[in-house]
């Protein structure tokens, strides 16, 4: 996700097909306010960024609105009038979907179904992770829609659940970002709990001298 040019490291994130964030780490330009210029069509004139990200008082990124039909971002990062990095990118490669919204759980005997509102575009996977205090690792289940059923649970155990959305690799390529995790929700006997006991870590074997 990082491009390099003249001491500039670039990172692009395309949030939910709505907002593009381009950030830079300008090691060669300390205390410089680099400017960001962009367009979504080659035939347009460049616009200058209106929403800059600041770090220690200096520009370190830009946030810009995009629409789903905007798929190529042409941009130039400049030090004064001198371009220090110019590129054009298919922005779908850098998709980061939004976190699951309106998450709900329904219990039926030894299974739980997590549902949430599907995002408005295709090519996504909805992943649910869960674990009990007896699990050292999260277990995972994913589906193409936000309707994920986890089976073979023990109703007496407390389970922590969390969910996220990922871009399918065969739609967007391998370099996208998963969404942030939803809040962890804990359940036991079909009811919510504030928390579950921490997972037990296996005792470390004692080394004989």
């Amino acid at each position: 996700q990082v491009a390099t040019g003249e001491g500039l490291q670039i990172q692009i994130m395309y949030f939910n097909l709505e907002t593009v964030q381009v950030t830079w780490n300008a090691s060669h330009y300390p205390r410089s306010n680099l400017s960001f210029h962009y367009k979504f069509s080659r035939d347009e004139a460049y616009d200058q960024c209106t929403v800059y990200i600041l770090q220690e008082g200096h520009t370190s990124g830009c946030l810009l609105d995009a629409e789903q039909q905007d798929d190529i971002l042409y941009f130039s990062i400049r030090n004064g009038t001198h371009p220090v990095f110019t590129a054009s990118r298919w922005i779908f490669y850098y998709l980061k979907p939004s976190s699951p919204k309106q998450v709900s759980f329904s219990w039926h005997q030894d299974a739980v179904t997590l549902t949430c509102s599907d995002l408005s575009y295709r090519g996504l996977l909805y992943e649910v992770q869960y674990r009990s205090p007896f699990d050292t690792e999260w277990q995972s289940k994913q589906e193409n829609t936000c309707n994920v059923t986890v089976e073979d649970l023990d109703a007496e155990k407390c389970y922590a659940f969390r969910a996220r959305v990922k871009a399918m690799e065969d739609a967007y390529g391998p370099d996208t970002y998963p969404s942030d995790w939803s809040e962890v929700t804990c359940w036991q006997r079909g009811e919510t709990r504030d928390s579950c006991p921490e997972p037990r870590t296996p005792p470390k074997p004692k080394l004989s001298k």
Partner: antibody, heavy 122, light 107 residues
């Protein structure tokens, strides 16, 4: 199994135009997600991407060529076309049509035609 | 445009040899780098997509690696049918661009 067959190549005079066709079989060019492209290979063997047309008919062109080329398609004939104007000697190349592989986001080209040779000379 | 530079431009090797071809991008492209093989008079054929994923039907002696700006294509044990020209191609930058090719010849 997709099969692509290009036609329309030959000898063209400088300043002239060409229209190449690419007939697809075994796969519908309107299949959601897929993009279709023209790529050319110069006599020195270098490859140049020329442009795409999507399943939704959206087109993208190489900025170096944009003012001289048009890519179109005929769904009924399951074919795509390349129209190129103001030809010059340096446009001499083998012209390929190809399909993009990944979900429409225009990545690798997994199916290619056999190519058609265009020679621009007076 | 993102420039793709392959090295070497030509290479002589023998059947059974292990061969490595490198491709360098002028800007970072993540893992969105693809490799093609072309034999004389034929169209290029996709070998590896996204730096390391073997295309269906491609023999396992071919492998790819790398991310960012530096990538390699390795043939673990050359077979007679592998003598051809190999090209890399990047896809996140617009327009997509190819390397100049590496011609693999019989020693």
């Amino acid at each position: 199994q997709v099969q692509l067959v290009e036609s329309g190549g030959g000898l063209v005079k400088p300043g002239g135009s060409l229209r190449l066709s690419c007939a697809a079989s075994g796969f519908s060019i309107t299949t959601s997600g897929y993009y279709w492209t023209w790529i050319r290979q110069f006599p020195g063997k270098g490859l140049e991407w020329m442009g795409y047309i999507g399943y939704n008919s959206k087109t993208y062109y190489n900025p170096a060529l944009k003012s001289r080329i048009t890519i179109s398609r005929d769904n009924a004939k399951n074919s795509l076309y390349l129209q190129m104007n103001s030809l010059r000697a340096e446009d001499t190349a083998v012209y390929y049509c190809a399909r993009s592989l990944y979900g429409g986001y225009k990545d690798a080209f997994d199916s290619w035609g056999q190519g058609t040779l265009v020679t621009v000379s007076s | 445009d993102i420039q793709m530079t392959q090295s070497p431009s030509s290479l002589s090797a023998s059947v059974g040899d292990r061969v490595t071809i490198t491709c360098r991008a002028s800007q970072s492209i993540g893992t969105s780098l693809h490799w093609y093989q072309q034999k004389p008079g034929k169209a290029p054929k996709l070998l590896i997509k996204f730096a390391s994923r073997l295309q269906s039907g491609v023999p396992s002696r071919f492998s790819g690696s790398g991310s960012g700006t530096d990538f390699t294509l390795t043939i673990s044990s050359l077979q007679p049918e592998d003598f051809a020209t190999y090209y890399c191609q990047q896809s996140p930058g617009f327009p997509p661009t190819f390397g100049q090719g590496t011609k693999l010849e019989i020693k």
